[in-house]
């Protein structure tokens, strides 16, 4: 029951996380800037991974997409790649984990197969979450190093004087969404991996055996005891004794013919 709950919760947490990663990737507010030296009106600029927008206090808003691929900063391309890889891995992980859920029966799928699928999806979620966290962190670092140092450096260009605009660069909402979403996906992945341990059949345990003395006809077969090592034929912890001896799992089973003589 705990395994099913852990697996189910891991799936839900990862699902929310991946939805958040997708949302963060699509959002425009990765970086926001205040052009506070502008004498006209409050002008706010905000940029995403795909387009740049300007919003004025008058209500006017305009966005323009980055239509070039080659001319963009390498760091932006790297962040885009990390986020997309995160989404793709997360989506595949979700697909795999749906079939791995203990509460969903698909044909005669073995628990070992479900355990493997749960582990696979868990690893995918972990990598997906790490990709998202890495992407957002790279972008945040780019903002800190490149832009918060932005002062009014003046130099002369061909068409006259050029200066960097004194802007106040701040982390956009998408960064926080990305960090939280990446963290959730990571946590969900860890939960799936934990659930996998509970799903995997124990192959090296020694099952306790209870003996029921139910009369004179109980036949004890010498040499009948075989410890399941995982290498022999008894990998599924099958019942060894014919008589009243049963494994702990079968104590509640129906009475055998030997119980009534």
């Amino acid at each position: 029951m705990a395994v099913t709950a852990c697996q189910g919760l891991g799936f839900v947490v990862s699902l929310i996380g991946i939805a958040g990663i997708i949302a963060a990737t699509c959002m425009d507010q990765w970086s926001t800037q205040d052009l506070y030296n502008n004498p006209v009106t409050a002008v706010f600029n905000y940029q995403g991974l795909w387009r740049s927008c300007v919003r004025e206090s008058s209500g006017f808003t305009e966005c323009r997409g980055y239509f070039t691929l080659l001319g963009l900063p390498a760091m932006l391309q790297a962040v885009r790649a990390l986020m997309i890889v995160g989404i793709v891995l997360g989506a595949i992980g979700l697909l795999v984990s749906i079939f791995a859920l203990k509460c969903i029966r698909i044909g005669s799928m073995e628990d070992s197969a479900k355990a493997n699928m749960t582990l696979t999806s868990g690893i995918m979620f972990i990598v997906s979450g790490l990709c998202a966290i890495a992407g957002v962190s790279v972008f945040a670092n780019m903002l800190v190093t490149n832009f918060w140092m932005s002062t009014a450096n003046m130099y002369t260009g061909m068409g006259g004087m050029v200066q960097t605009v004194q802007t106040r660069y701040t982390f956009g909402a998408a960064l926080f969404v990305g960090w939280v979403a990446g963290g959730l996906t990571l946590i969900g992945g860890v939960m799936m991996c934990i659930a996998c341990r509970g799903l995997a059949p124990e192959e090296t345990n020694y099952k306790a055996v209870s003996y029921h003395a139910s009369g004179h006809s109980v036949a004890y077969k010498p040499g009948g005891f075989k410890a399941s090592t995982g290498f022999g034929s008894n990998t599924k912890n099958k019942k060894i004794y014919d008589g009243g001896a049963r494994t702990e799992d079968e104590v509640q089973s129906y009475p055998s013919k030997h119980d009534y003589v």
Partner: nanobody, 122 residues
Framework: QVQLVESGGGLVQPGGSLRLSCAAS????????MGWYRQAPGKQRELVAV???????NYADSVKGRFTISRDNAKNTVYLQMNSLKPEDTAVYYC????????????????WGQGTQVTVSS
């Protein structure tokens, strides 16, 4: 390389009119605010008029009602229509643009033109 080229300056009589234009060219991604500043001999550079992409404008008190700023976002061009010119309007008029480049849309720059001379004299 981005260039701001001003044109339309010259000598005009008091009460006359002039139309300045400034065209920005180069690998521009988006121009935010465009404007006109002026610098009279022996004085500091001062704001004349500015305009945002959304056409919000601001004028210096000394030119309000006489000067009109406009822009064409598609052509990356700003205009300054100057009417009822006075001798005190004599100055070098500089075009200004806050813009970002196609190669780095995350960084904003202020570019200045080299200026056009406006002389109001009888």
């Amino acid at each position: 390389q981005v260039q701001l080229v001003e044109s339309g300056g010259g000598l005009v009589q008091p009460g006359g009119s002039l139309r300045l234009s400034c065209a920005a060219s180069g690998s521009i991604f988006m121009i935010n605010v465009m404007g006109w500043y002026r610098q009279a001999p022996g004085k500091q550079r001062e704001l004349v008029a500015v305009i945002t992409r959304g056409a919000s404008t601001n004028y210096a008190d000394s030119v309000k009602g006489r000067f009109t700023i406009s822009r064409d976002n598609a052509k990356n061009t700003v205009y300054l229509q100057m009417n009822s010119l006075k001798p005190e309007d004599t100055a070098v008029y500089y075009c200004n643009a806050d813009l970002n480049l196609a190669s780095d849309p995350f960084k904003w720059y202020t570019y200045w033109g080299q200026g056009t001379q406006v002389t109001v004299s009888s």
